[in-house]
């Protein structure tokens, strides 16, 4: 799941990883745009083993993966794309 959240909460990520995670092991990707209390964009990945990791938005692999998911958003996906508006 690729989700875009707009929130007034402060930053969620204390530290970020750039280590590649294959798509088959990912359950959900949450994108928190910068602003509203956090000065940077954050990407949170929920993995199939129930663990969660913050990923460096500059990591090449996550940028490539999000682009692939966006391109596929017109079809039914194992990793579907959702967007949430400002409440």
């Amino acid at each position: 799941v690729l989700e875009v959240y707009y929130t007034s909460l402060r930053c969620r990520c204390v530290q970020e990883s750039s280590v590649f995670i294959p798509r088959r092991f990912i359950d959900r990707i949450q994108i928190l745009p910068r602003g509203n209390g956090c000065p940077r964009k954050e990407i949170i990945v929920w993995k199939k083993n129930k663990s969660i990791v913050c990923v460096d938005p500059q990591a090449e692999w996550i940028q490539r993966m999000m682009e692939v998911l966006r391109k596929r958003s017109s079809s039914t996906l194992p990793v579907p794309v959702f967007k949430r508006k400002i409440p």
Epitope: I21, R23, R24, W61, S75, L77
Partner: antibody
Amino acid sequence: EVQLVESGGGLVQPGGSLRLSCAASGFTFSDYYMAWVRQAPGKGLEWVASINYDGGDTYYRDSVKGRFTISRDNAKNSLYLQMNSLRAEDTAVYYCAREEDYDGSYVMDAWGQGTLVTVSS
Amino acid sequence: DIQMTQSPSSLSASVGDRVTITCKASQNINKELTWYQQKPGKAPKRLIYNTNILQTGVPSRFSGSGSGTEFTLTISSLQPEDFATYFCLQQSSLYTFGQGTKLEIK
């Protein structure tokens, strides 16, 4: 040349334990996710578990969760599978496989020859 | 969990025949599918990955196609060394193998 050599299989009673090893050579072991796949006699293939580069991330099929533990030692170029509380249905040839990866699609490109685990009383 | 249904489970054919094996996924897996060949007592050998990319060293008589939920492996002209068992594997969400297709000499 990529080589994966499994060892540690054998006959074990139900409820018993066994530790499988896989010695890797011919590639930079720490650059790859690794997996265990099994095949019951005369049956199909079944993914068992996977582990990330440094061993910090592990994934299991539901039927082995809590009983099996996948681990690795990058300094020794070795992959392990600790199997506890073994059941008759765990009887299979266990293969070690390298998970080649670029975008999450190119997977399990190299396999060992397998080691047979027989669970029987 | 994604289920893979492979058919047929067994197939008899002759040298020179064109053979097609099918795998159907229970949900969309895009093109994230691999085909393996396995001979008795041996480890599986990867033939095709990403649905249609031929593994280096694999003869061009092997080809793969499909997308979404339906995939096929085609052998255009069977050779004696092709008689084996073939498995598909989805790697879109964890891993699931098809049940296998045993290709036998008629």
